[in-house]
Each structure stands twice: as structure tokens, then as C-alpha cells.
């Protein structure tokens, strides 16, 4: 009876279990009753990082110097190239597809430490009583306005992104 499932590192095709190609190799032809799976090594600047049945290898990532990128780790037939940014610049994401001078802290966050040549901006959430309504690479969280010191009362509570709104006190006649 033909199998309905195959072992690890195998795949089911034409009611038959065939071996997957190992990392660094692509599929040329499926196995048959009489032949093994045929695989071929990936070419220069190509890779496959899993046991697979792919007919094409993936291209290595290009670290574009026009975007400030350089190669941190050269790709192999089994691994992609890893890019990083030129000294003093910082990756915009984990995938490091482009470089920025420094990261900004979003509204609700303040700058804990300004970026340096080696470390990016460090942000921290604004605690209760403080807010930030801007994206900035230097501004800290600002304290909520103290309505009491202006002889006013809080009309609208503050949040981590907004200041309190002060208004006049209700006067009793």
C-alpha cells in the first residue's frame, strides 16, 4: 500500500517517499521506484538553508554600499549573506536592509541615551506623570503640567503621549 506520510527529511510524491535535498543543494529530479532523488549544489552567490525540494536556490542578499551597508558575514551555499551598517550608522530592522544615523523614540517614549558612534539611541517608556508627543532622537519624557501651581484644575488627564489639560476651578457663588 502506498504511504500517506514520510519520514523526516523525506517528501511524498507520486505515492512514493523521496529524500529531500540537503542544505546547499537544489532538486534536479524526484526519485523513482528505481532511482534516488537527484540534487545539485547551489551555484556561486546562491544558497538554500533547509532540507528542501526547491528547484532554484535563493540569491545571496546584496549589501548595497549606496545604502550604507557592508558585508558582516559572507554567505555560503547553506547560509545567506549578513549585512551590517558602516561605522556610526545603525540598521533600520533586524534584517538590516538600510541604515539610519540613529533611531528615534516614538511618542510615548523618551530618549534615555543619545546615540553614539557605537550604540544606537536608547528609548524608555514615559512613566506615569510624564509624556512625549513627538518622535525624537534627543527629547526626554516631559513631566505633565502641574495645574495646581497655576491655580487651575485638571480637566483632562494626561497619558504617556499627551499632557494634562488644565482649566479654571469651579467657583462657588
Amino acid at each position: 500500500e502506498p504511504p500517506t506520510a514520510c519520514r523526516e527529511k523525506q517528501y511524498l510524491i507520486n505515492s512514493q517517499c523521496c529524500s529531500l535535498c540537503q542544505p546547499g543543494q537544489k532538486l534536479v529530479s524526484d526519485c523513482t521506484e528505481f532511482t534516488e532523488t537527484e540534487c545539485l549544489p547551489c551555484g556561486e552567490s546562491e544558497f538554500l538553508d533547509t532540507w528542501n525540494r526547491e528547484t532554484h536556490c535563493h540569491q545571496h542578499k546584496y549589501c548595497d554600499p549606496n545604502l550604507g551597508l557592508r558585508v558582516q558575514q559572507k554567505g555560503t551555499s547553506e547560509t545567506d549573506t549578513i549585512c551590517t551598517c558602516e561605522e556610526g550608522w545603525h540598521c533600520t530592522s533586524e534584517a538590516c536592509e538600510s541604515c539610519v544615523l540613529h533611531r528615534s523614540c516614538s511618542p510615548g517614549f523618551g530618549v534615555k541615551q543619545i546615540a553614539t558612534g557605537v550604540s544606537d539611541t536608547i528609548c524608555e517608556p514615559c512613566p506615569v506623570g510624564f509624556f512625549s508627543n513627538v518622535s525624537s532622537a534627543f527629547e526626554k519624557c516631559h513631566p505633565w503640567t502641574s495645574c495646581e501651581t497655576k491655580d487651575l484644575v485638571v480637566q483632562q488627564a494626561g497619558t504617556n503621549k499627551t499632557d494634562v489639560v488644565c482649566g479654571p476651578q469651579d467657583r462657588l457663588r
Epitope: 550604507g68 558602516e86 539610519v100 544615523l101 540613529h102 532622537a137 527629547e139
Partner: nanobody, 116 residues
Framework: EVQLLESGGGLVQPGGSLRLSCAAS???????EMWWVRQAPGKGLERVS?????????YYADSVKGRFTISRDNSKNTLYLQMNSLRAEDTAVYYC?????????WGQGTLVTVSS
């Protein structure tokens, strides 16, 4: 396309002054936090000063505090850096930058040389 054109650099004696300008185009200048960043020969990038979009809040590195003043004219799309009491260690290429600054938007900078 973002364009930032720095000018005003030159050779100045220690203790002297210079005013750098940065003409911005290709983006809405008044909406962006702006920075002055410098790179001394053989050194890394140093963030010198920053100013918020409205020009009401500023930042200065400890190395320039009390000597440099950042300002902006949103009607002229121009950023300034007034540098007084210049020292030899202020010698560098000075760049202006918007937030965020992508590598491809990086300008040519203006060279400031402080020497007697």
C-alpha cells in the same frame, strides 16, 4: 529627493568663530528634528547638536555646550550652527541631518579647520 547643503566652513584660529548653514530641500523642513553631526579626521561620527521642528528645544554634546548655538529658520528652510571659542579639537567635517537620516541622504559636509 532629500538634499542638504552645508556651507560656512573654513580655516579659523583658536578662539575664533564661524557660522555654519545648511540649506534643506526635498522635504517639509518645518516638520523635522534636525541635527549637526561631525567627523574629525580618523575618528567616528559625533552628534554635536539637535533642534526640534519648532526651534524651541535643543540638545548639545558636552564637548560644545556653552560654545555652540543651534538655530533654524523654517521660512528659509535653513539650519544654523554658531560656533564660538573654537578649539583645535573642533576640527572636523560638519554635516547636517534630518531625523530620520538615511545613509543615501547624507550630504558632503563642510570642513572646519581650527589652527594657528
Amino acid at each position: 529627493e532629500v538634499q542638504l547643503l552645508e556651507s560656512g566652513g573654513g580655516l579659523v584660529q583658536p578662539g575664533g568663530s564661524l557660522r555654519l548653514s545648511c540649506a534643506a530641500s526635498g522635504f517639509t523642513f518645518r516638520d523635522y528634528e534636525m541635527w549637526w553631526v561631525r567627523q574629525a579626521p580618523g575618528k567616528g561620527l559625533e552628534r554635536v547638536s539637535a533642534i526640534n521642528p519648532q526651534g524651541t528645544r535643543t540638545y548639545y554634546a558636552d564637548s560644545v555646550k556653552g560654545r555652540f548655538t543651534i538655530s533654524r529658520d523654517n521660512s528659509k528652510n535653513t539650519l544654523y550652527l554658531q560656533m564660538n571659542s573654537l578649539r583645535a579639537e573642533d576640527t572636523a567635517v560638519y554635516y547636517c541631518a534630518k531625523l530620520p537620516t538615511y545613509f543615501k541622504d547624507w550630504g558632503q559636509g563642510t570642513l572646519v579647520t581650527v589652527s594657528s
